[in-house]
């Protein structure tokens, strides 16, 4: 089948990184600079994406693959193929339309992106709070009091104190 197809269409023999040049009797010509073909049998090479301004080059364009961009420092990629950039926040914050805002009491975010999520409710699993939650970290649940062997010291969860200067939004 391959032999038949190539007899019918000489372009099918052109590998990735080349194009079938109609101006040169359908011979396989290398992709010109700043262009690529990621599959064989192409009649043209595609122009490489340019990562400029808000974007930086993560992977250079080659004759067989497009360039890949990421975002300028302080931002991270959003959208297919990093088509836009979203502002980073600090851990303990989430991004709103007006910028980065601290997580409300009872929620946390341990990443530079994404939203603040509620602390785990240990009691739903019949457990107790071993380590209190913060804006940046979830609570750590410990064994339930019933799981503790006689004589073992139980961790009493301290009342969730508000962090200084932090009020719920």
């Amino acid at each position: 089948f391959e032999r038949t197809r190539s007899l019918q269409d000489p372009c099918s023999n052109c590998p990735a990184g080349t194009f079938c040049d109609n101006n040169r009797n359908q011979i396989c010509s290398p992709c010109p600079p700043n262009s690529f073909s990621s599959a064989g049998g192409q009649r043209t090479c595609d122009i490489c994406r340019q990562c400029k301004g808000v974007f930086r080059t993560r992977k250079e364009c080659s004759s067989t693959s497009n360039a890949e961009c990421d975002c300028t420092p302080g931002f991270h990629c959003l959208g297919a193929g990093c088509s836009m950039c979203e502002q980073d926040c600090k851990q303990g914050q989430e991004l709103t339309k007006k910028g980065c805002k601290d997580c409300c009491f009872g929620t946390f975010n341990d990443q530079k992106r994404g939203i603040c999520r509620p602390w785990t409710n240990c009691s739903l699993d019949g457990k107790s709070v071993l380590v209190n939650g913060t804006k940046e970290r979830d609570v750590v649940c410990g064994p339930s009091p019933a799981d503790l062997s006689p004589g073992a010291s139980s961790v009493t969860p301290p009342a969730p104190a508000r962090e200084p200067g932090h009020s719920p939004q």
Epitope: R49, G53, V54, T72, G79, G81, K98
Partner: antibody
Framework: QVTLKESGPVLVKPTETLTLTCTVS??????????VSWIRQPPGKALESLVH???????FFSTSLKSRLTISKDTSKSQVVLTMTNMVPVDTATYYC????????????????WGQGTMVTVSS | DIQLTQSPSFLSASVGDRVTITCRAS??????LAWYQQKPGKAPKLLIF???TLQNGVPSRFSGSGSGTEFTLTISSLQPEDFATYYC?????????FGQGTKVEIK
């Protein structure tokens, strides 16, 4: 408030050189995320990109007009200057400058702010 | 350079109509496409970037879709202020190129 304003001659003669200035305010031309483009539009026709300049002085020109165009910027004056040599009547158009490299929580590289444009007529 | 072809070039529609404009790229450009609206005597205004993301302040009746070589701009219910010319622009590489425009006129 972010603005761009084009200025330059309203009328140029064939074979003369056109010099247009884009004065920006509300942002800095030294910001690494920002680029400024010149775009033109002949009466009743489509938009045509001419040239783009970034803060690092990297420049990208229209393939068909490259030999006639120069672009420079003066960051201290907040100005981007376009020159186009050997003007001909078909260069009659409204010339716009526009910024790309959005500001805010989501940034992109479409042209988010445009000047109001300046109409240039090429005639003897 | 990447060529963009818009269809139709002219479109007559009535207030309340759903309007769809197509933009085809001469090569794949992923979702690196923007849409602009231009009214007579005015500069273009950015409506959509990254093929489908609405610019701040643009009414939600505007939407964009598509990826690769085929893109659409849809106005779900045409308003009197939407009669204008619409342009697509590729954001894949420099120089940026535009489509030839689609003029939306009152029927």
């Amino acid at each position: 408030q972010v603005t761009l304003k084009e200025s330059g001659p309203v009328l140029v003669k064939p074979t003369e050189t056109l010099t247009l200035t884009c004065t920006v305010s509300g942002f800095s031309l030294s910001n690494a995320r920002v680029g400024v483009s010149w775009i033109r539009q002949p009466p009743g026709k489509a938009l045509e990109s001419l040239v783009h300049i970034f803060s690092n002085d990297e420049k990208f020109f229209s393939t068909s007009l490259k030999s006639r165009l120069t672009i420079s910027k003066d960051t201290s004056k907040s100005q981007v200057v376009l020159t186009m040599t050997n003007m001909v009547p078909v260069d009659t158009a409204t010339y716009y400058c526009a910024r790309n490299g959005g500001f805010g929580v989501i940034i992109h590289d479409a042209f988010d702010i445009w000047g109001q444009g300046t109409m240039v007529t090429v005639s003897s | 350079d990447i060529q963009l072809t818009q269809s139709p070039s002219f479109l007559s529609a009535s207030v309340g109509d759903r309007v769809t404009i197509t933009c085809r790229a001469s090569q794949g450009i992923s979702s690196y496409l923007a849409w602009y609206q231009q009214k007579p005597g005015k500069a273009p205004k950015l409506l959509i970037f990254a093929a489908s993301t609405l610019q701040n302040g643009v009414p939600s009746r505007f939407s964009g879709s598509g990826s690769g070589t085929e893109f659409t701009l849809t106005i779900s219910s045409l308003q009197p202020e939407d009669f204008a010319t619409y342009y697509c622009q590729q954001l894949n590489n420099y120089p940026r190129t535009f489509g030839q425009g689609t003029k939306v006129e009152i029927k």
